[in-house]
């Protein structure tokens, strides 16, 4: 049987993804993070 018409099952949300690297000192290396919508998630 053919499928009855329905919208796709998901919505697309557009958000800005910002990668950043921060120098935290000579012996501590760097912190690499991912900010999604203003919240650091990694």
């Amino acid at each position: 049987d053919a499928e009855f018409r329905h919208d796709s099952g998901y919505e697309v949300h557009h958000q800005k993804l910002v990668f950043f690297a921060e120098d935290v000192g000579s012996n501590k290396g760097a912190i690499i993070g991912l900010m999604v919508g203003g919240v650091v998630i990694a």
Partner: antibody, heavy 123, light 112 residues
Framework: QVTLKESGPALVKPTQTLTLTCTFS??????????VGWIRQPPGKALEWLAH???????SYNPSLKSRLTISKDTSKNQVVLTMTNMDPVDTATYYC???????????????WGQGTTVTVSS | DVVMTQSPLSLPVTPGEPASISCRSS???????????LEWYLQKPGQSPQLLIY???NRFSGVPDRFSGSGSGTDFTLKISRVEAEDVGVYYC?????????FGQGTKLEIK
């Protein structure tokens, strides 16, 4: 509020063509995602889906009846029309129209029904 | 066509007692968009059908919370936690995932 009302002849003869009109208010068939369908119910029996038309004029029919059915809309009059050719006594039923709206934020089910119109096919 | 089979076809219930109606589809009614378009309608005596439950388990506005829907795949259930006199009528399950849309034979709920 949303209302739908079916109208058409109460009696048709075998081989004739039935024309039913669904007149609705409280929503518009020019609204994206909006649709209106037809369902019938023979006396004492279960419901049977017939056809559906969408705001963009896309149409869907029950394959077992497709050759006999035509669904159309008049957006400016807030009406949907169903025609069924070559009527037979087994087509005696109450015919309902109902609204269904696509969309993730919509119910996407037949949320409002008309009161139904009874059609008898007899010579 | 997807055949919808309801049981029981007749359901006598004492007011205040629970009731359960089963609906099975002859094939999966999972739509390619990830939703299952399984609906429950109630047709009260002399009235048009009215929507109770959509997409398996969502109550339509104004439907009392004593009504609940559940299930997946091909096996679905409508439950009424405490039956009231106003719940009498014929209950239909329906699938809207595939063409043609199809309905069960109906379950007639009556008060004992």
């Amino acid at each position: 509020q949303v209302t739908l009302k079916e109208s058409g002849p109460a009696l048709v003869k075998p081989t004739q063509t039935l024309t039913l009109t669904c007149t609705f208010s409280g929503f518009s068939l020019s609204t994206s995602g909006m649709g209106v369908g037809w369902i019938r119910q023979p006396p004492g029996k279960a419901l049977e889906w017939l056809a559906h038309i969408w705001w963009d004029d896309d149409k869907s029919y029950n394959p077992s009846l497709k050759s006999r059915l035509t669904i159309s809309k008049d957006t400016s009059k807030n009406q949907v029309v169903l025609t069924m050719t070559n009527m037979d006594p087994v087509d005696t039923a109450t015919y309902y129209c109902a609204r269904r709206q696509l969309g993730l934020r919509s119910i996407d089910a037949m949320d409002y029904w008309g009161q139904g119109t009874t059609v008898t096919v007899s010579s | 066509d997807v055949v919808m089979t309801q049981s029981p076809l007749s359901l006598p219930v004492t007011p205040g007692e629970p009731a359960s109606i089963s609906c099975r589809s002859s094939q999966s009614i999972l739509h390619s968009n990830g939703n299952t378009y399984l609906e429950w309608y109630l047709q009260k005596p002399g009235q048009s059908p009215q929507l109770l439950i959509y997409k398996v388990s969502n109550r339509f506005s104004g439907v009392p919370d004593r009504f609940s829907g559940s299930g997946s795949g091909t096996d679905f259930t409508l439950k009424i936690s405490r039956v009231e006199a106003e719940d009498v009528g014929v209950y239909y399950c329906s699938q809207a995932s595939r063409v043609p849309l199809t309905f069960g034979q109906g379950t007639k709920l009556e008060i004992k």
